[in-house]
Interface confidence: low
């Protein structure tokens, strides 16, 4: 089981207007025609990706400004894995297989990407962080 949904961020957060009008299962949040799960426990990047895939999702693929702002606000001060990783000798890739095209700056020099409200950065993949899954609406 992925675990119960919660918002570990430190700020009060008003739900986006379309969050409650969705086709997402219990414990998932709908936004911009995607369903999101925000974990309440910490895992490594690979373990988090596996947890997402058990539910037909991937670690979050971020492909719009709205998605990015939504996730940063949800993450708050806590670091959350998202679905961007770099294998040696390869470009950054999203967990859906798409190559990353550098539309935002990833700080740090590690292989796995996390976000929080103030930054998108990289960290050693074995570190245990919260994580965010997403998948399209049914």
């Amino acid at each position: 089981s992925v675990g119960q949904y919660n918002c570990p961020g430190q700020y009060t957060f008003s739900m986006p207007s379309d969050s409650h009008v969705s086709s997402c299962s219990e414990d998932w949040v709908g936004y911009q025609r995607k369903c999101y799960f925000i974990s309440t426990v910490k895992r490594s990047w690979t373990s988090a990706q596996n947890a997402c895939s058990e539910h037909g999702a991937t670690l979050a693929v971020i492909d719009s400004e709205k998605d990015m702002n939504f996730l940063k606000r949800y993450a708050g001060r806590e670091e959350h894995w998202v679905g961007l990783k770099k294998e040696p000798g390869h470009p950054w890739k999203w967990s859906n297989g798409k190559e990353f095209n550098n539309w935002f700056n990833v700080t740090g020099s590690d292989k796995c990407v996390f976000l929080k409200n103030t930054e998108v950065s990289s960290m050693e993949c074995e570190k245990n962080l919260y994580w965010i899954c997403n998948k399209p609406y049914k």
Epitope: S64, M68, W92, N101
Partner: antibody
Framework: VQPGGSLRLSCAAS????????MHWVRQAPGKGLEWVSS????????YYADSVKGRFTISRDNSKNTLYLQMNSLRAEDTAVYYC??????????WGQGTLVTVSS | DIELTQPPSVSVAPGQTARISCSGD??????VYWYQQKPGQAPVVVIY???KRPSGIPERFSGSNSGNTATLTISGTQAEDEADYYC???????????FGGGTKLTVL
């Protein structure tokens, strides 16, 4: 401008936080398609160039003036084109300048 | 570097569906963007991230991308859709932008 000459293009931006955005130059020769020329990160720490202009063109920006520049040296006839500056936002060019025609001819 | 190939021209009757292809090696592993350009004007993005429409772009514009081919589809084509269309992608290692050669869409 004559072949071998130099020219500096500028692009003044407004309405957004200029320093937060990667900016690009894209050109279009008369009757031809779009050709990417160069890009620069928000802090100017990274710059990239098309092979066709590398070593001749230099992209720069002044965030205090919200202005993007393209210094073009050793100009050739094949550099004749409309040059557009464009904002790169979530991997597409969402705002473009109106374009400026550069003609290289003797 | 990736090269993007588009047909030089596509013709369609008003109200019919126009499809413009863009092919490149393993293009499906990258995001593709589509721009519309009318004479004397700067390009306008009509599809980003393979299949997403910016606000203000009519629903008749849609996109897909898999394998080696991306496709821009215009359903119920209107006279005002007559323009040049360019696909765009990128090279991940060098952050270089690549455009297709452009397709002139004629609405008969």
């Amino acid at each position: 401008v004559q072949p071998g000459g130099s020219l500096r293009l500028s692009c003044a931006a407004s309405g957004f936080t200029f320093s937060n955005f990667v900016m690009h130059w894209v050109r279009q020769a008369p009757g031809k398609g779009l050709e990417w020329v160069s890009s620069i990160s928000g802090s100017s720490s990274s710059t990239y160039y098309a092979d066709s202009v590398k070593g001749r063109f230099t992209i720069s920006r002044d965030n205090s003036k919200n202005t993007l520049y393209l210094q073009m040296n050793s100009l050739r006839a094949e550099d004749t084109a409309v040059y557009y500056c464009a904002r790169y936002y979530y991997a597409s060019f969402d705002y473009w300048g109106q374009g400026t025609l550069v003609t290289v001819s003797s | 570097d990736i090269e993007l190939t588009q047909p030089p021209s596509v013709s369609v009757a008003p109200g019919q569906t126009a499809r413009i292809s863009c092919s490149g090696d393993s293009l499906g592993s990258k995001y593709v963007y589509w721009y519309q350009q009318k004479p004397g004007q700067a390009p306008v993005v009509v599809i980003y991230g393979d299949s997403k429409r910016p606000s203000g772009i009519p629903e008749r514009f849609s996109g897909s991308n898999s394998g080696n081919t991306a496709t821009l589809t215009i359903s119920g084509t209107q006279a005002e859709d007559e323009a040049d269309y360019y696909c765009q992608s990128y090279t991940s290692f060098t952050t270089k932008i690549v455009f297709g050669g452009g397709t002139k869409l004629t609405v008969l």
